[in-house]
């Protein structure tokens, strides 16, 4: 026997009280598929969370977080306040990274910079708080009679002193 | 943690009314719908209605004696009953769920509940 549930269309629900009759969802629900016999409360966006999409009767509301905040979670559950490049948010706030570390986003932790040296590697580029530093060629790749490829100096015009 | 309280109980004569508040603390009702069960002593646990954004729904065995309403700014949700009969004697509880109506849901919370005695 089939359910007389079954034919309620995603937006109703399914009326156990009422000879099984579909009723649509009040406002502010949803039931985003049929046979329901409930409807699911509407996510409210509110506080540091704003609507990206509105609650309709057959899908939930979908929120982001207010500028100087960013979501974190499934569905943006959380909104957690953004800091600047070189900081990590602790629990009393934006804080710069430490000497030895770098954030180049708004979010998230401080990581240590990268060891050039593990990788026998030399530093190019000194890091800073917002930075990593960028590794260069190795020392044997600088050493005399390396095999890397030099474009030649230019050539200087006699009685000229260098630039 | 979202703590409900139920008030208003008490003895009524038959074919009286009484109204129930059910208050919430912790947390607003704004994102929930609110709902009244009942259990009578010796009996299962009965659905009574529940509110939501301007909407009621009621079980099938009140007949347009108990209407449920919402007070806002007081943050408490009424349970209005008349005509009332012996058989509605009972502990009235109010519960809040993400799910409208609740009759076939068990809810998120659930007060402590309030007595209702109809005896002449």
């Known amino acids: 026997l089939q359910d007389p549930c079954s034919n309620c269309p995603a937006g109703t629900f399914c009326d156990n009280n009422r000879n099984q009759i579909c009723s649509p969802c009040p406002p502010n629900s949803f039931s985003s598929a049929g046979g329901q016999r409930t409807c699911d409360i509407c996510r409210q966006c509110k506080g540091v969370f704003r609507t990206r999409k509105e609650c309709s009767s057959t899908s939930n509301a979908e929120c982001d977080c207010t500028p100087g905040f960013h979501c974190l979670g499934a569905g943006c559950s959380m909104c957690e306040q953004d800091c600047k490049q070189g900081q990590e948010l602790t629990k009393k706030g934006c804080k710069d990274c430490c000497f030895g570390t770098f954030n180049d986003q708004k979010r998230g932790i401080c990581r240590p910079w990268t060891n050039c040296s593990l990788d026998g590697k030399s530093v190019l580029v000194n890091g800073t708080k917002e930075r990593d530093v960028v590794c260069g060629p190795s020392p044997a790749d600088l050493s005399p009679g390396a095999s890397s490829v030099t474009p030649p100096a230019p050539a200087r015009e006699p009685g000229h002193s260098p630039q | 943690e979202v703590q409900l309280l139920e008030s208003g109980g008490g003895l009524v004569q038959p074919g009286g009314s009484l109204r129930l508040s059910c208050a919430a603390s912790?947390?607003?009702?704004?994102?929930?719908?609110v709902g009244w069960f009942r259990q009578a002593p010796g009996k299962g646990r009965q659905y009574v209605g529940t509110?939501?954004?301007?909407?009621?729904h009621y079980g099938d065995f009140e007949n347009n004696r108990f209407t449920i309403s919402r007070d806002n700014s007081k943050n408490t949700v009424y349970l209005q009953m008349n005509s009332l009969r012996a058989e509605d004697t009972a502990v009235y509880y109010c519960?809040?769920?993400?799910?409208?109506?609740?009759?076939?849901?068990?809810?998120?919370?659930q007060g402590q509940g309030t007595l209702v005695t109809v005896s002449s």
């Open positions: 519960a809040i769920s993400l799910k409208y109506p609740m009759a076939t849901v068990t809810p998120d919370y």
């Open positions: 912790g947390r607003t009702f704004d994102n929930y719908a």
């Open positions: 509110y939501w954004s301007g909407y009621a």
